[in-house]
């Protein structure tokens, strides 16, 4: 008769593992007792459970509750054992030894393996910054056994680089993902993908990308020079701009206070109807937490009645 | 041969304990599997606990968490220690031992254990 086994046994973390020991003989042959031990090098053999033809199973206090015998119908020359909820320590070489009358004792070994799926981690980086160089965005880690595998999946350009550290029974893998951050990745998403072979499917955490910028300022509403005349109603200057995170407006008089009248409301400047008082030079100052800036227009307001033509002139600054 | 020579039976009330001993005549060490049956009157012999020579136990469902068996090698005994007693758990105690794996076993004379409610 000969012993049908496995080579390597392989279970997540947490799932039944089933221990294969199988006795082919002849007719006529019978097993009398199934002896199943741990056999890491190293170490001596250490009983995990016996089964007895007549006494049935019996199981080592370290194992009391985990082992079994796999469920009915059950063949006398079958001494499978189910160890139940494997753990990481289980992890390594077994041995079942057969007793068979009259044919004598066979042993095997097999390996077990358990696979300790990752739970992965994502950490973003510092807050990204329009202009600033190569920068950190974010790394993902996640250990389990064996090593797990880390990628980035993302429409962002950028360069990745990993490492990892084993430990006694698992190795922890790091990926950190590097950008030249720019407005344009604003709100895009950068996600981690995590393989492992204990996983049904990979496990994707996914960061959304926040880069802090202001555009240049600019004013619109001077784009048609005549309109800008006394008597005039409805005239407003817009600032426009724009950033993360969203910037506030100030409007202030470069060569004094606000007329009277005059609205600020928000991005907007609201005239009343306009008079010659109206004409002066006006800053759009915008800002956020990441930078300021300010754009400045003229504004000359033309009296129908004065023989001067309009001028306006249009100048910005950061 | 392997002489087991038990002890520790007797009177008991519900509720009480019992400490059997089965003292071998050679190294239980190297005895393949030690134990102990019980019959009661009318009934079938039926295992109630068992040791091997690894360590490893078993414990008939009937007396699990009240029944515990263990084995000193330097003193070639096995114990039996009952716990919550109950009527049902009436019987002889018989000690077996399977010196080689598959010959007849050894067995002791029997105690008589009564629990009386």
């Known amino acids: 008769g000969e012993l049908e086994t496995s080579d390597v046994v392989t279970v997540v973390l947490g799932q039944d593992a089933k221990l294969p020991c199988f006795y082919r003989g002849d007719s006529g042959e019978q097993v009398g007792q199934v002896a199943w031990a741990r056999a890491d090098a190293g170490e001596g053999a250490q009983e995990l459970a016996l089964l007895h033809s007549k006494y049935g199973l019996h199981v080592s206090p370290a194992y009391e509750g985990r082992v079994e015998q796999p469920p009915p119908p059950r063949n006398p020359l079958d001494g499978s054992v189910l160890l139940r909820n494997a753990v990481q320590a289980d992890e390594g070489e077994y041995e079942c030894r057969v007793s068979t009358f009259p044919a004598g004792s066979f042993q095997a070994r097999l390996r077990l393996r358990v696979l300790v799926p990752p739970l992965p981690s994502l950490n973003p980086g510092p807050a990204l910054e329009e202009g600033q160089g190569l920068t950190l965005a974010a790394s993902c880690t996640a250990e389990g056994s064996p090593a797990p595998s880390v990628t980035w999946d993302t429409e962002v350009k950028g360069t990745t680089s990993s490492r990892s550290f084993k430990h006694s029974r698992s190795a922890a893998v790091t990926s950190e993902f590097h950008l030249v951050p720019s407005r344009s990745m604003n709100g895009q998403p950068l996600t981690c993908v995590v393989s492992h072979p204990g996983l049904l499917q990979d496990q994707r955490i996914t960061h959304i990308l926040h880069v802090s910028f202001l555009a240049e300022a600019s004013v619109r509403g001077l784009e048609d020079q005549n309109l800008w005349h006394v008597g005039r109603e409805g005239a407003m200057l817009k600032c426009l701009s724009e950033g993360q995170p969203p910037p506030s407006y100030n409007w202030t008089r470069l060569d004094g206070p606000l007329p009277s009248g005059v609205r600020v409301d928000g991005d907007t400047l609201g005239f009343p109807p306009l008079t010659t008082e109206h004409s002066g030079i006006y800053v759009c100052h915008v800002s956020n937490e990441f930078s300021s800036r300010d754009s400045q227009v003229t504004v000359d307001v033309l009296d129908p009645q004065e023989d001067s033509g309009k001028q306006v002139d249009l100048v910005s600054a950061s | 041969e392997v002489q087991l020579v038990e002890s520790g039976g007797g009177l008991v009330q519900a509720g009480g304990f019992l400490r059997l001993s089965c003292a071998a005549s050679r190294s239980v060490f190297r005895i393949n599997v030690m134990g102990w049956y019980r019959q009661a009157p009318g009934k079938q012999r039926e295992l109630v606990a068992g040791?091997?020579?690894?360590?490893?136990?078993r414990l008939a469902d009937s007396v699990k968490g009240r029944f515990t068996i263990s084995r000193d090698n330097a003193k070639n005994t096995v114990y039996l220690q009952m716990n919550s007693l109950k009527p049902e758990d009436t019987a002889v105690y018989y000690c077996?031992?399977?010196?080689?794996?598959?010959?007849?076993?050894?067995w002791g004379q029997g105690t008589q254990v009564t629990v009386s409610s």
């Open positions: 040791i091997t020579s690894g360590g490893s136990r």
């Open positions: 077996f031992a399977e010196a080689v794996v598959g010959d007849e076993p050894y």
